[in-house]
């Protein structure tokens, strides 16, 4: 190798200056004894190189780029060789920003996968490889005192969420959780969450069903629907409140919300609806009165209100 580039920093803040030096060894005797060293950033020649012969006979050119406005570029030093440019050495330059503080960190406990899933917003693009790590520790109190550290959770590339498996969790005990972002220009940390995994539990929704008509039960009145639901069994011992939403199948009507439903009610008569109209219904639940997250809305149930109370046969349309 006849030439070698060294730079003040291969990674800088976008827009910052960068200084580079290219040294040509003396023993490259086939070269012009007084070669002119040229600089190129990407495809563009860069003026302003200051060249000198050093005491050991090597040639050095130093250039300062006042603003590196490319997020990635190759800087090369070269010599004119006949009709072409002979590149002696090149380095990759990167420019970007230190990571912003990750924000909107939130977590939910999934009882089926037995994991605490945390997500966050990484902030603006840094233009540099930036790693995110979900860090956590167990705490007996309100996270002022740190207990056992929990193994770092590293998301897959490009993802802004990570799952802490059950073996690293302790239910009914607080955990300190935060996100650390790191790249070549710096490190930032999100504000710390302090939570008990059970306080961010997200239940599965119940399954809506039509109420089986019984001989002794009065049929629904016009504009009414009789519903029942099967709670999600693994969440059965968790006190919760639920709410229904409904809308006519046809037309552009928005959802109408009904709730909270009576505690532990597993059936409900919904009235005040249009007679002889098909409705779409869904239900969702949340741990209550203790903290939790709303479940997703259940799969839809389609039901039709009666024209008037039927005299004999009672027909349900059930998907």
């Amino acid at each position: 190798e006849c030439g070698h580039i060294s730079v003040s920093a291969p990674i800088v803040h976008l827009g910052d200056p960068i200084t580079a030096s290219c040294i040509i060894k003396q023993n490259c005797s086939h070269l012009d004894p007084e070669p002119q060293i040229l600089w190129r950033l990407g495809a563009e020649l860069q003026p302003g190189g200051r060249q000198q012969r050093l005491s050991d006979g090597t040639q050095e050119s130093i250039i300062t780029l006042p603003h590196l406005n490319h997020t990635q570029a190759f800087l090369s030093c070269a010599l004119n060789w006949g009709n072409s440019l002979q590149i002696l050495d090149q380095v990759e330059l990167r420019a970007g920003y230190p990571p912003a503080i990750p924000h909107n960190l939130s977590c939910l406990m999934n009882l089926t996968t037995s994991s605490l899933i945390c997500q966050w917003e990484p902030g603006p693009e840094t233009h540099l490889p930036t790693s995110f790590t979900l860090k956590s520790f167990k705490s007996r109190g309100n996270c002022q005192t740190q207990g056992d550290s929990i193994l770092d959770c590293v998301p897959k590339d490009g993802q802004s969420h990570c799952s802490i498996p059950r073996k690293h969790l302790l239910l009914y005990q607080n955990m300190g959780i935060w996100v650390q972002a790191e790249n070549a220009l710096g490190t930032s940390m999100s504000p710390q969450l302090c939570l008990d995994p059970m306080d961010v539990v997200k239940l599965e929704p119940p399954m809506l069903r039509t109420m089986d008509p019984s001989p002794e039960a009065a049929p629904p009145q016009a504009g009414c629907l009789q519903l029942s639901w099967e709670p999600w069994q693994p969440g059965l011992h968790i006190n919760q409140k639920c709410e229904l939403r409904h809308k006519p199948q046809r037309g552009e009507a928005s959802w109408a919300l009904v709730g909270p439903l009576p505690l532990e009610a597993l059936q409900y008569e919904l009235c005040g609806l249009l007679p002889a109209t098909a409705y779409t219904l869904q239900i969702r639940c949340i741990r209550w009165p203790l903290p939790g997250h709303w479940s997703d809305w259940s799969p839809s149930l389609e039901l039709r209100t009666t024209e008037r109370a039927p005299t004999h046969h009672h027909h349900h349309h059930h998907h």
Partner: antibody
């Protein structure tokens, strides 16, 4: 300190009835599911029945369905198990227990022995 | 119904031994597996809930692991007060069911 104290056990003839009670203290009784678990002499544990915090949901083991009724009085912090049409195979120590949110029993009462024999 | 199969049904061990008891569910129960200790003439006592969470006041030599259908209770160094019968229980759905028990005896 959470405490559960069962009472009402004893000797009863086959076909007879008995009502077990469980007095709870040291926690907000009305917020928790409760349950009964029994253990026949020299045997393992068998879940009998549970009741939701307000009493609206009451699952039963097939072996007692239609014969036993679980209930609660939240104003008295007391859980009950009404046992009718008792059989010899119902002979066991009956424990009442508080149910955790994810289906565990803790704590347990000291147990009350029910003997069904002629 | 979900069947819970515990093994072994009994074992003999010495103080200081590492003891492992397994529990297998007939279908997946996520982490809804609880372990109890019972001594003769006494009520059962909760040791571990949700497969691996140590109940308050239970010594750290007890640990639980597993998920889905296969679970393990481990006593890292058996102490004299640990000789008892151990039961697993699933809380995933009704009817709630217990394993048949494992009696840990002194060798």
């Amino acid at each position: 300190e959470v405490q559960l104290l069962e009472s009402g056990g004893g000797l009863v003839q086959p076909g007879g009835s008995l009502r077990l009670s469980c007095a709870a203290s040291g926690f907000t009784f009305s917020l928790y599911w409760m349950g009964w678990v029994r253990q026949a002499p020299g045997k393992g544990l068998e879940w009998v029945s549970s009741i939701s915090s307000s009493g609206g949901v009451t699952p039963y083991a097939d072996s007692v369905k239609g014969r036993f009724t679980i209930s609660r009085d939240n104003s008295k912090n007391t859980l009950y198990l009404q046992m009718n049409s008792l059989r010899a195979e119902d002979t066991a120590v009956y424990y009442c227990a508080k149910l955790g949110e994810l289906g565990w029993f803790d704590p347990w009462g000291q147990g009350t022995l029910v003997t069904v024999s002629s | 119904d979900i069947q819970m199969t515990q093994s072994p049904s009994s074992l003999s061990a010495s103080v200081g031994d590492r003891v492992t008891i397994t529990c297998r569910a007939s279908q997946g129960i996520s982490s809804y597996l609880n372990w109890y200790q019972q001594k003769p003439g006494k009520a059962p006592k909760l040791l571990i809930y949700y497969a691996s969470n140590l109940q308050n006041g239970v010594p750290s030599r007890f640990s639980g692991s597993g998920s889905g259908t296969d679970f393990t209770l481990t006593i890292s160094s058996l102490q004299p007060e640990d000789f008892a019968t151990y039961y697993c229980e699933q809380g995933w759905n009704y009817p709630l069911t217990f394993g048949g028990g494992t009696k840990v005896e002194i060798k």
